[in-house]
């Protein structure tokens, strides 16, 4: 079945942008001017998820790349990774659970909770130039709030 998708950039609540750091990692840092062109453009898709009143299930792919953010156990810890997929089959309505994030949107601030690991969120560090990761705490030092901006192609 076809899915609704959009192209966007994400910034954390400290206005740090997300950029590629090597082939399979994202990092967050402050960008200005022409450097803004470095930021990753996501293809966010509306996918199937579990019933909820305030959570909207989405998948986060990298635009025009066959890479999706996914959540897996590594050394017994929920971990965020970029995973290659077959572009002929993605995005799809019924994404595997590791690719699904529950988008929680309050006052134009977005959180992305892992569907595979409830209460684990896409997170950034306070520090500059650090990897984007899956964090198990909300409201602590790490940042779990993002803003989204559409990207015109």
């Amino acid at each position: 079945a076809p899915v609704r998708s959009l192209n966007c950039t994400l910034r954390d609540s400290q206005q740090k942008s997300l950029v590629m750091s090597g082939p399979y990692e994202l990092k967050a840092l402050h960008l200005q001017g022409q450097d803004m062109e470095q930021q990753v453009v996501f293809s966010m898709s509306f996918v199937q998820g579990e019933e909820s009143n305030d959570k909207i299930p989405v998948a986060l792919g990298l635009k025009e790349k066959n890479l999706y953010l996914s959540c897996v156990l590594k050394d017994d810890k929920p971990t965020l990774q970029l995973e290659s997929v077959d572009p002929k089959n993605y995005p799809k309505k019924k994404m595997e659970k590791r690719f699904v994030f529950n988008k929680i949107e309050i006052n134009n601030k977005l959180e992305f909770e892992s569907a595979q690991f409830p209460n684990w969120y896409i997170s950034t560090s306070q520090a500059e130039n650090m990897p984007v990761f899956l964090g198990g705490t909300k409201g602590g030092q790490d940042i779990t709030d993002f803003t989204m901006q559409f990207v015109s192609s």
Epitope: A1, P2, V3, R4, S5, L6, N7, C8, M44, F46, E51, S52, N53, D54, I56, V58, K93, K103, E105, N108, L110, T147, M148, Q149, F150, V151, S152, S153
Partner: antibody, heavy 119, light 108 residues
């Protein structure tokens, strides 16, 4: 305060074209999706389509090909281009804001603009 | 495409009555359903989303329930301001969004 104001409606002949505008204030089109919904006189609501970014638009099956949604974020305006108009396109056309991305429901609506297709 | 069917099409009731409007989807839509109220000459107003969550500023006499393909809107004690037309809406069916045909609530 969130506001949506439609304009551009009026009388048009069958086969003609019309472009409706929806100017918004109190929020940014760079973070909210916008939809068009129409209502024929004395009839129910009918979804036309929705726009996220300029490249991501989705339409009701009956609207594909004849109707096009676009936007100019710098002008805070969303457009509905309607071509090859027919008598059955006569309706009040509303623009509406999607409450949250992919929520599919609409929390703010304009007052509507009437389009009459008649010779 | 998913088709939404409301019943009844028209409903007469009195102030203080408990009113139930039903909406059926042609296939399962989980809880991706909203309800709107519309008064003549006015734009629709969002009442309920995700089948049961009350929208901001909506009185608590309105409630929604259901999941899958069967949904209900209940007004626990009808007030004079509630006479209007009510629409259900499928909000999560693939790329398309669809409204029911409406239920007109009139004074008995």
């Amino acid at each position: 305060e969130v506001q949506l104001v439609e304009s551009g409606g009026g009388l048009v002949q069958p086969g003609g074209s019309l472009r409706l505008s929806c100017t918004v204030s109190g929020f940014s089109l760079s973070s909210y999706a916008m939809s068009w919904v129409r209502q024929a006189p004395g009839k129910g609501l009918e979804w036309v389509g929705i726009i996220y970014d300029s490249a991501s638009t989705y339409y009701a099956s009956w609207a594909k090909g004849r109707f096009t949604i676009s936007k100019d974020t710098s002008k805070n305006t969303v457009y509905l281009q309607m071509n090859s108009l027919r008598a059955e396109d006569t309706a009040v056309y509303y623009c509406a804001r999607e409450r949250a991305i992919f929520s599919g429901d609409f929390d703010y609506w304009g007052q509507g603009t009437l389009v009459t297709v008649s010779s | 495409e998913i088709v939404m069917t409301q019943s009844p099409s028209t409903l007469s009731a009195s102030v203080g009555d408990r009113v139930i409007i039903t909406c059926q989807a042609s296939q399962s839509i989980d809880n991706w359903l909203s309800w709107y109220q519309q008064k003549p000459g006015k734009a629709p107003k969002l009442l309920i989303y995700r089948a049961s969550t009350l929208a901001s500023g909506v009185p608590s006499r309105f409630s929604g329930s259901g999941s899958g393909a069967e949904f209900t809107l209940t007004i626990s004690s009808l007030q004079p301001d509630d006479f209007a037309t009510y629409y259900c809406q499928n909000t999560g069916g693939g790329v398309s969004i669809a409204f029911g045909q409406g239920t007109k609530l009139t004074v008995l």
